[in-house]
């Protein structure tokens, strides 16, 4: 008799999830010499232990502590790039500007990027059929709690000038409900962080508006200022040219506004 299985509103665990996490861990530790000591089997066991046999709406940050400990990795605190709703460009940027880091450039972020996972209460099975949706089902699901945990710690690590890339094509350029707006902004440490610099990325070729004057950016500035952190904002009118100029800063066309 087939066991009754909870139907959630979100997609199920990414297929071949265990193999993917393990393979990513091995690949990452091969590429990054400072992480060669990491035992990827232990990392997978800690990852699995965070959600297997647990109700997927009752996951806590504490469940991920063993994984956090095994994934310890000092990030240069003044080279942190946060992003919201513009992941691809942020990652393209750090692939060129190798001394800067998004969360997904760390081992823990790299392991989980674009993956979904959940288990079931009292069984050791991974649920490949469906997982809880943050809005429709519950917020304390394995994926959301993981990203909340690592994002909080990543923001806590930041110092000096922290950069955030924001999507100027969205109706809410700064969204209080995004991971950046709900977690990272509130976990920047004022005693360590001097300035948050927002880079607003324009979508349209002919868009010459100053999106730094957008009401949601003003809201971000207000939140940051109240936390005793300075705020600055730059328009990136031409993201393609921006990336090109990061690659070749000596190019004569790179002295003008991007």
């Amino acid at each position: 008799v087939p066991r009754w299985r909870q139907q959630w509103s979100g997609p199920g665990t990414t297929k071949r999830f265990p193999e993917t996490v393990l393979a990513r861990c091995v690949k990452y530790t091969e590429i990054h010499p400072e992480m060669r000591h990491v035992d990827c089997q232990s990392v997978w066991d800690a990852f699995k232990g965070a959600f297997i046999s647990k109700h997927p709406c009752n996951i806590t940050e504490e469940d991920y502590q063993p994984l956090m400990k095994l994934g310890t990795q000092t990030v240069p605190c003044n080279k942190i790039l946060l992003w919201s709703r513009i992941k691809d460009l942020a990652h393209q940027f750090t692939q060129v500007q190798r001394d800067m880091f998004t969360l997904e450039d760390t081992l823990l972020g790299y392991l989980a990027d674009d993956l979904t996972w959940c288990g079931e209460f009292n069984t050791s099975k991974i649920n490949y059929q469906s997982c809880p949706d943050w809005r429709k089902d519950c917020s304390n699901n394995p994926v959301s709690v993981f990203w909340k945990t690592v994002s909080r710690r990543f923001a806590e690590a930041a110092c000096d000038v922290v950069h955030v890339m924001l999507n100027g094509s969205r109706s809410k350029i700064f969204d209080k409900n995004s991971t950046f707006g709900s977690v990272e902004v509130h976990n920047l440490q004022p005693e360590k962080v001097q300035t948050l610099e927002a880079w607003v990325i324009h979508g349209g070729r002919e868009d010459s508006r100053d999106l730094c004057q957008d009401p949601t950016i003003k809201e971000l500035e207000s939140i940051i200022s109240k936390r005793n952190i300075q705020f600055s904002c730059k328009n990136i009118y031409r993201p393609d040219k921006f990336l090109q100029c990061v690659k070749n800063p000596e190019d004569s066309s790179c002295t003008s506004e991007i």
Epitope: K69, L70, G71, T74, V75, C77, L108, E156, A157, C159
Partner: antibody, heavy 122, light 107 residues
Framework: QIQLVQSGPGLKKPGESVKISCKAS????????MHWVKQAPGKGLQWMGW????????TYAADFKGRFVFSLEASASTANLQISNLKNEDTATYFC???????????????WGQGTSVTVSS | NIVLTQSPATLSVTPGESVSLSCRAS??????IHWYQQKSNESPRLLIR???QSISGIPSRFSGSGSGTDFTLSINRVESEDFSIYYC?????????FGSGTKLEIK
């Protein structure tokens, strides 16, 4: 209250080994990494390395690779430093110190052991 | 490895004077610098964290400033109990380093 209590002083001969223990109390042992610091007589502080108190994985500073081993007795909330094949230049006070492990950063060393004096002399 | 250079090596002052101790990093390290005081035959004690953040229980005459490569520990009106050695330490890299220390002595 938070305490790091180290084992007592030792007088050793060159070529011998010494094991220094550092027993932690007053906090969750695995929340903090344990660092080891050497101070030769009349000299400054020299960082030796640290051990991840959850995984037991040690990291050694360049000058302390080979004869130096960090280990844990996690159930006893104790970190150990073992030095083998002792040399005269190992004569020093050795401190353990805890550091909060924030995954992507380390806080400073906010609690220190009282130090263990090791004298190496023939 | 990040090298921390402390200056001066020795500073002679009279109680009541105000002093500044310098720590310079070989590369930019944000605000990842911490200051310790070590009295004779004692363990080091954390004074300032992250360049300028004060520590509970440490007298308010101790303050820190700086970011990037240049950092300063200031003692406002030195008291007799302050004569000891001061070390800076960086946690920017996972390979921690200490400065060589500044000895504060009575003139």
């Amino acid at each position: 209250q938070i305490q790091l209590v180290q084992s007592g002083p030792g007088l050793k001969k060159p070529g011998e080994s010494v094991k220094i223990s550092c027993k932690a109390s007053g906090y969750t042992f695995t929340d903090y990494s344990m660092h080891w610091v050497k101070q030769a007589p009349g000299k400054g502080l020299q960082w030796m390395g640290w051990i991840n108190t959850y995984s037991g994985k040690p990291t050694y500073a360049a000058d302390f690779k080979g004869r130096f081993v960090f280990s844990l007795e996690a159930s006893a909330s104790t970190a150990n430093l073992q030095i083998s094949n002792l040399k005269n230049e190992d004569t020093a006070t050795y401190f353990c110190a805890r550091c909060y492990d924030g995954t992507f950063y380390y806080d400073p060393m906010d609690a220190w052991g009282q130090g263990t004096s090791v004298t190496v002399s023939s | 490895n990040i090298v921390l250079t402390q200056s001066p090596a020795t500073l002679s002052v009279t109680p009541g004077e105000s002093v500044s101790l310098s720590c310079r990093a070989s590369q930019s390290i944000g605000t990842s610098i911490h200051w310790y005081q070590q009295k004779s035959n004692e363990s080091p004690r954390l004074l300032i964290r992250y360049a300028s953040q004060s520590i509970s229980g440490i007298p308010s005459r101790f303050s820190g400033s700086g970011s990037g490569t240049d950092f300063t520990l200031s003692i406002n009106r030195v008291e007799s109990e302050d004569f000891s050695i001061y070390y800076c330490q960086q946690s920017y890299s996972s390979l921690v380093t200490f400065g060589s220390g500044t000895k504060l002595e009575i003139k």
